[in-house]
């Protein structure tokens, strides 16, 4: 399996946005890469977002995706927006080298994203 590295812990900012880098050790000269973010919570794994990109080009997520990202070489900079405290969990980066063959796939150990809902502002008189 291909090695995928990602940070162990990331704290979302006050606007509920968290960013982390997903880095993969490419065994070949991939031209097309698929990146998927999975969330693991309570032994349940769900897909958060996914994008296929051409090397050197921007990642294109679906219009309604909560993820955005950029790529540079074998690194993908992922940003997840709109997070709330209930979204705290382990976010796993899965990378697939789709083309040219051979196909390679690697899964990171996951990034624990902590989200703290901001305190509501007190009423000012």
């Amino acid at each position: 399996a291909m090695h995928v590295a990602q940070p162990a812990v990331v704290l979302a900012n006050s606007r509920g946005t968290a960013s982390f880098v997903c880095e993969y050790a490419s065994p070949g000269k991939a031209t097309e890469v698929r990146v998927t973010v999975l969330r693991q919570a309570d032994s349940q794994v769900t897909e958060v977002c996914a994008a296929t990109y051409m090397m050197g080009n921007e990642l294109t997520f679906l219009d309604d995706s909560i993820c955005t990202g950029t790529s540079s070489g074998n690194q993908v900079n992922l940003t997840i927006q709109g997070l709330r405290a209930m979204d705290t969990g382990l976010y796993i980066c899965k990378v697939e080298l789709m083309y040219p063959p051979p196909y390679y796939m690697g899964i990171g150990n996951g990034t624990q994203i902590y989200v703290i809902d901001p305190e509501p502002c007190p009423d000012s008189d």
């Epitope: 399996a1 291909m2 070949g28 000269k29 031209t31 097309e32 296929t52 051409m54 789709m98 083309y99 040219p100 063959p101 051979p102 196909y103 390679y104 796939m105 690697g106």
Partner: antibody, heavy 122, light 112 residues
Framework: EVQLLESGGGLVQPGGSLRLSCAAS????????MSWIRQAPGKGLEWVSG????????DFADSVKGRFTISRDNSKNTLYLQMNSLRAEDTAMYYC???????????????WGQGTLVTVSS | QSVLTQPPSASGTPGQRVTISCSGS????????VYWYQQLPGTAPKLLIY???NRPSGVPDRFSGSKSGTSASLAISGLRSEDEADYYC????????????FGGGTKLTVLG
């Protein structure tokens, strides 16, 4: 049942054109890269062209570069090979094949069509 | 001229063990997986071995693959008449314009 079905072969004069089609069924076509492979009468297998699952990346053998183009329509589950400036040496059975994968594993060309015969002759 | 080199022919009698070799280089077999295909007369090729030594479901365990350095081999034990076919090795090559490379094929004849 996972299946690939080629069509579009036939007899064509040198310099002519043909478009081969490969209809896929029984699997999620848009998830797989695809290839065209040919086999001249009595000869071995020769890889011709490949295309990524999205259609964004393509490759060609030097022997067909500049004359053949590969494309796909994921909404129609169909792979194409447009062959222009055909030569006698392009005479062969043309197969489409799926580039398979499962889990962490590359599976090679795990599904093949039955082939379509292209004959280039005057 | 094929990138991977196979003997053009091989033969054996029913029940025998036959080995077919496939030789390449560091840019293909040396750094990539090897695959084997069986082509029965008048039919399309069929995947026999993937990832050097793995069999797809439905392929008998009489067929086995191995790889060492820049060479690979396909072994068929307990040879049967229905094994008479052409066998092709395939790998990927990082140094060529096209990623897929084949051997020239080996015609296996089952004698007797």
């Amino acid at each position: 049942e996972v299946q690939l079905l080629e069509s579009g072969g036939g007899l064509v004069q040198p310099g002519g054109s043909l478009r081969l089609s490969c209809a896929a069924s029984g699997f999620t076509f848009k998830a797989y890269s695809m290839s065209w492979i040919r086999q001249a009468p009595g000869k071995g297998l020769e890889w011709v062209s490949g295309i990524s699952n999205t259609g964004g990346s393509t490759d060609f053998a030097d022997s067909v570069k500049g004359r053949f183009t590969i494309s796909r329509d994921n909404s129609k589950n169909t792979l194409y090979l447009q062959m222009n400036s055909l030569r006698a040496e392009d005479t062969a059975m043309y197969y489409c094949a799926r580039l398979g994968y499962s889990g962490y594993d590359d599976r090679g060309m795990d599904v093949w069509g039955q082939g379509t015969l292209v004959t280039v002759s005057s | 001229q094929s990138v991977l080199t196979q003997p053009p022919s091989a033969s054996g009698t029913p029940g025998q063990r036959v080995t077919i070799s496939c030789s390449g280089s560091s840019s293909n077999i040396g750094s990539n997986y090897v695959y084997w295909y069986q082509q029965l007369p008048g039919t399309a090729p069929k995947l026999l071995i993937y990832g050097n030594s793995n069999r797809p479901s439905g392929v008998p365990d009489r067929f086995s693959g191995s790889k060492s350095g820049t060479s690979a081999s396909l072994a068929i034990s307990g040879l049967r008449s229905e094994d008479e076919a052409d066998y092709y090795c395939q790998s990927y090559d990082s140094s060529l314009s096209g990623p897929v490379v084949f051997g020239g094929g080996t015609k296996l004849t089952v004698l007797g």
